[in-house]
Interface confidence: medium
């Protein structure tokens, strides 16, 4: 709305940088062939690039990434009894970000 | 995968709490009747509840919210010239979070 301007602070751009995000650990990251199990924990924190850039046609992208393996519990319920196994999920953390030009493919003439 | 367990740290649950997120300011928040304008800044930071809860059938939800009006620029392009106007967008910040039971409607018998 265009009203109540007085009380409003000027909006500050969310700069392009790494922020803590929540990553849901989906079961198919652990086992694509079986669905009869649970994963614990169901979500973890990751560092990801987000925010906006000062110009159009540029996008906030990761310029440096790091893969981080973490152990999760794979909990299979077999005959009403849980079987716990360790599984490794590899998370991707963004270490640095940059505003990168979006390359749009030129139409073939 | 179940391999390379040694190098992996145990995964830590992303607890239910407020985190800084990036909110894209869409044009229809400012003017639903007109699309011939740009908004600056295109995105801002907000505080939002995210993460997982320790138990089944519970979800991370905001328990306290605050509305925060911010001023943005509405940039209309008229005859190839920009016209700057002020507009107010009301953002929603989450101040506190809680793990809340998901009420699933019972089937009617």
């Amino acid at each position: 709305s265009l009203g109540s301007l007085a009380a409003a602070e000027p909006a500050v751009i969310a700069e392009c940088k790494t922020r803590t995000e929540v990553f849901q650990i989906s079961r198919n990251l652990i086992d694509r062939t079986n669905a009869n199990f649970l994963v614990w924990p169901p979500c973890v924190e990751v560092q990801r690039c987000s925010g906006c850039c000062n110009n159009r046609n540029v996008q906030c992208r990761a310029s440096q990434v790091q893969m981080r393996p973490v152990q999760v519990r794979k909990i299979e319920i077999v005959r009403k009894k849980p079987i716990f196994k360790k599984a490794t999920v590899t998370l991707e953390d963004h270490l640095a970000c940059k505003c990168e030009t979006i390359v749009t493919p030129r139409p073939v003439t | 995968s179940l391999g390379s367990l040694a190098a992996a740290e145990p995964a830590v649950i992303a607890e239910c709490k407020t985190r800084t997120e990036v909110f894209q300011i869409s044009r229809n928040l400012i003017d639903r009747t007109n699309a011939n304008f740009l908004v600056w800044p295109p995105c801002v930071e907000v505080q939002r509840c995210s993460g997982c809860c320790n138990n089944r059938n519970v979800q991370c939800r905001a328990s306290q919210v605050q509305m925060r009006p911010v001023q943005v620029r509405k940039i209309e392009i008229v005859r190839k010239k920009p016209i700057f106007k002020k507009a107010t967008v009301t953002l929603e910040d989450h101040l506190a979070c809680k793990c809340e039971t998901i009420v699933t409607p019972r089937p009617v018998t």
């Epitope: 319920i77 009403k80 849980p82 716990f84 | 367990l5 740290e9 145990p10 320790n54 138990n55 519970v58």
Partner: antibody, heavy 120, light 107 residues
């Protein structure tokens, strides 16, 4: 205050029965798995039985299978262990303990224990 | 049935590092927890999921687990750390405890 309080222990003859209770307070009992662990005099810890948050999953140590039954009443915040056909080797301090998750995990809260003596 | 083996006793001088081992077949494939029990008291969790410390447990307690052996390490051991220590793992549908290790702080 978060706590677990066991009761129901005592002296019982071999072949007899006993029902242990564990009253939980200070946390949402219905959200967590629970276990019973015992410790014979001068000996180490022995896990006895487990029950998930809603009671749908239960399992027992081989040494008590078929004789002991674990149950819970979430409306009363209470865990139970029904012990039948008791033997001298069941003599121990019985602890109830809380898991941090609905499915189990480590035991992050223990009661003070209740002594069960099986003797003629 | 699955067994966890601990040394019956470990002795350490105050200020030194104490290491208590827990061994079992492919133990590194399971999450190991450690409990401390002082005479006449209930057990207390000191390490969970191999290497995590619950709040309130001093930083001198640490843990590791790989291969067939999990280790509880107490650095800068204090007199108050004298107790029985039990490792535990959830394996094959049952929680298993090691036989326990009596830690004696000399002096």
């Amino acid at each position: 205050e978060v706590q677990l309080l066991e009761s129901g222990g005592g002296l019982v003859q071999p072949g007899g029965s006993l029902r242990l209770s564990c009253a939980a307070s200070g946390f949402t009992f219905s959200s967590y798995a629970m276990s019973w662990v015992r410790q014979a005099p001068g000996k180490g810890l022995e896990w006895v039985s487990y029950i998930s948050d809603d009671g749908s999953l239960k399992y027992y140590a081989d040494s008590v299978k078929g004789r002991f039954t674990i149950s819970r009443d979430n409306s009363k915040n209470t865990l139970y262990l029904q012990m039948n056909s008791l033997r001298a080797e069941d003599t121990a301090v019985y602890y109830c303990a809380k898991h941090p998750y609905w499915y189990g995990g480590q035991l992050d809260l223990w009661g003070q224990g209740t002594l069960v003596t099986v003797s003629s | 049935s699955y067994e966890l083996t601990q040394p019956p006793s470990v002795s350490v001088s105050p200020g030194q590092t104490a290491s208590i081992t827990c061994s079992g077949d492919s133990l590194g494939s399971y999450f190991v927890h450690w409990y401390q029990q002082k005479p006449g008291q209930s057990p207390v969790l000191v390490i969970y999921d191999d290497s995590n410390r619950p709040s309130g447990i001093p930083e001198r307690f640490s843990g590791s687990n790989s291969g067939n052996t999990a280790t509880l390490t107490i650095s800068g051991t204090q007199a108050m750390d004298e107790a029985d220590y039990y490792c535990s793992a959830f394996t094959h549908n049952s929680d298993v405890f090691g036989g326990g290790t009596k830690l004696t702080v000399l002096g």
